[in-house]
């Protein structure tokens, strides 16, 4: 008698973009205009804002958030008509534990749908599934206690979920996403520029090591950081010049209460 293998394949059809150009990276082009545009982010599976230079670039660029969502998010129009009914967990939270093909013994966390809690498991290091988090906190914020954004539609997207942490002293809404604000960052009223310039540097969740720059609104300067290639936030620039050009103008110098520690 042969043993049947459980089908735990997690190729999430709903996560596939509708068009190949939706998988392209945001490309601001070589020009120097500063046009607010939107692109579909393959890693977060949502439409996000970026600054377009005004020429060249690629097809993954939209004038409105709505246009981006309609073009690149499968089933978006159906989802958008649903009434908001609180936070939902992404599909991958319900995938069974998969240690993957390799045996590297990495400590990871997954959401257990039986216990309704995030639990520790041993990941082999390659080719598991997306119910796999590097930290307990990350697992909890996405799968255990998803906090829904104050948005009129109920969209299940990664950035709708934020940490419900005790260290958060101030929250502000940026593009309908609740963003925890660090106490080291000046409050919103002291900054008149682009809201993402207030976000802390976020290295993301991938494997690359890319030199990037983020704007530190406490110092009014752009600093280098290591970006892993995907995820993260929009306070992420390929050059110091682009970073300063995008963020420097918004700081009201005499009102900044930020301190660098």
């Amino acid at each position: 008698l042969s043993e049947e293998a459980d089908d735990t394949d997690s190729e999430l059809g709903s996560m596939k973009p509708l068009h190949t150009f939706c998988a392209m990276k945001a490309d601001d082009g070589p020009c120097k205009a500063m046009i607010r545009s939107y692109f579909f982010n393959m890693y977060t599976h949502q439409c996000e804002e970026f600054i377009y230079g005004g020429c060249e670039g690629n097809e993954n660029r939209f004038d409105t958030l709505e246009e981006c969502k309609k073009t690149c998010i499968p089933g978006y129009e159906k989802t958008a008509v649903k009434a908001a009914s609180g936070a939902e967990r992404p599909d991958f939270c319900f995938l069974e534990e998969d240690p993957g093909l390799c045996r590297g013994y990495m400590k990871r966390y997954l959401y257990n749908n039986q216990t309704k809690q995030c639990e520790r498991f041993v990941y082999g290091g390659c080719l598991g599934n997306r119910n796999n988090f590097e930290t307990l906190d990350e697992c909890k914020k996405i799968c255990e206690n998803p906090v829904h954004s104050p948005s009129p539609v109920n969209e299940v997207q990664m950035s709708d979920y934020v940490t419900d942490g005790n260290t958060v002293t101030d929250r502000s809404t940026v593009n309908n996403i609740v963003v925890p604000q660090s106490p080291k960052v000046p409050r919103r009223r002291d900054y008149r520029g682009r809201p993402w310039c207030l976000q802390p540097a976020d290295s993301g969740l991938c494997k690359a090591s890319e030199r990037r720059f983020y704007y530190n609104s406490a110092t009014g300067k752009c600093h280098r950081f290591n970006y892993t290639g995907c995820g993260g936030n929009n306070n992420n620039f390929t050059t110091r010049r682009r970073c300063l050009r995008s963020c420097k103008t918004g700081l009201i110098k005499n009102k900044s209460k930020g301190v660098v520690k």
Epitope: C102, R103, K207
Partner: antibody
């Protein structure tokens, strides 16, 4: 030394099921330090991974989306082998089919391959 | 799917001379601990593929030290320091960063 010996028909009629077996010696299909895969090669498509099975606390499998609705890979622990079944074949499925062992411990790669079986889909 | 693109597709070589094959992936294959999720295989004429280089730069057992793998992010290279007649065949890169596992289209190395 791990050896993989493939067996199965070389000619399959369109709409029928392609069935191949890979017998393992020098390792166990239930080993938690390996995984077992089928890969095919055709002039038009090059090397194409079809699917894989592996045993950890239980059996897992993963399949390529291109064949997901038609493929089954099963372990047979009593005979220490694993099999490929591909339903509703068309001439497009004509290829050399390989079974391969994935080393989960050290190399993280396909370190042993079967001899290959040329399967022609034709009436 | 991660697309693996090799170049050149054909590489005529002279025995004793070096050779280099490039493989580019459509997304990064390097984990933050430095592990590279990329392997190289050689398929000699009339044979099954054999593992040559694993995790980007490690030689599989029995592979001569004239073979070396390098690269980071999305760009990878297989080098043969001095080509020998037995090195002819088709070389493939393969990623295992995410499903489905994908291979490059192959580079055919032949003696001039």
């Amino acid at each position: 030394q791990v050896q993989l010996q493939q067996s199965g028909p070389g000619l399959v009629k369109p709409s029928q099921t392609l069935s191949l077996t890979c017998a393992i010696s020098g390792d166990s299909v239930s080993s938690d330090s390996a995984a077992w895969s089928w890969i095919r090669q055709s002039p038009g498509r090059g090397l194409e991974w079809l699917g894989i099975i592996y045993k950890r606390s239980k059996w897992y499998n993963r399949y390529a989306v291109s064949v997901k609705s038609r493929i089954t890979i099963n372990p047979d622990t009593s005979k220490n082998q694993f099999s490929l079944q591909l339903n509703s074949v068309t001439p497009e499925d004509t290829a050399v089919y390989y079974c391969a062992r994935w080393d989960s411990d050290k190399m993280w790669g396909f370190d042993d391959w079967g001899q290959g079986t040329l399967v022609t889909v034709s009436s | 799917d991660i697309v693996m693109t090799q170049s050149p597709l054909s590489l005529p070589v002279t025995p004793g001379e070096p050779a280099s094959i490039s493989c580019r992936s459509s997304q990064s294959l390097v984990f933050r601990d430095g592990t590279t999720y990329l392997n190289w295989y050689l398929q000699k004429p009339g044979q099954s593929p054999q593992l040559l280089i694993y995790k980007g730069s490690n030689r599989a057992s029995g592979v001569p030290d004239r073979f070396s793998g390098s690269g980071s992010g999305t760009d990878f290279t297989l080098k043969i320091s001095r080509v020998e007649a037995e090195d002819v065949g088709v070389y493939y890169c393969q990623q295992y960063d995410s499903y489905p596992l994908t291979f490059g289209q192959g580079t055919k190395v032949e003696i001039k």
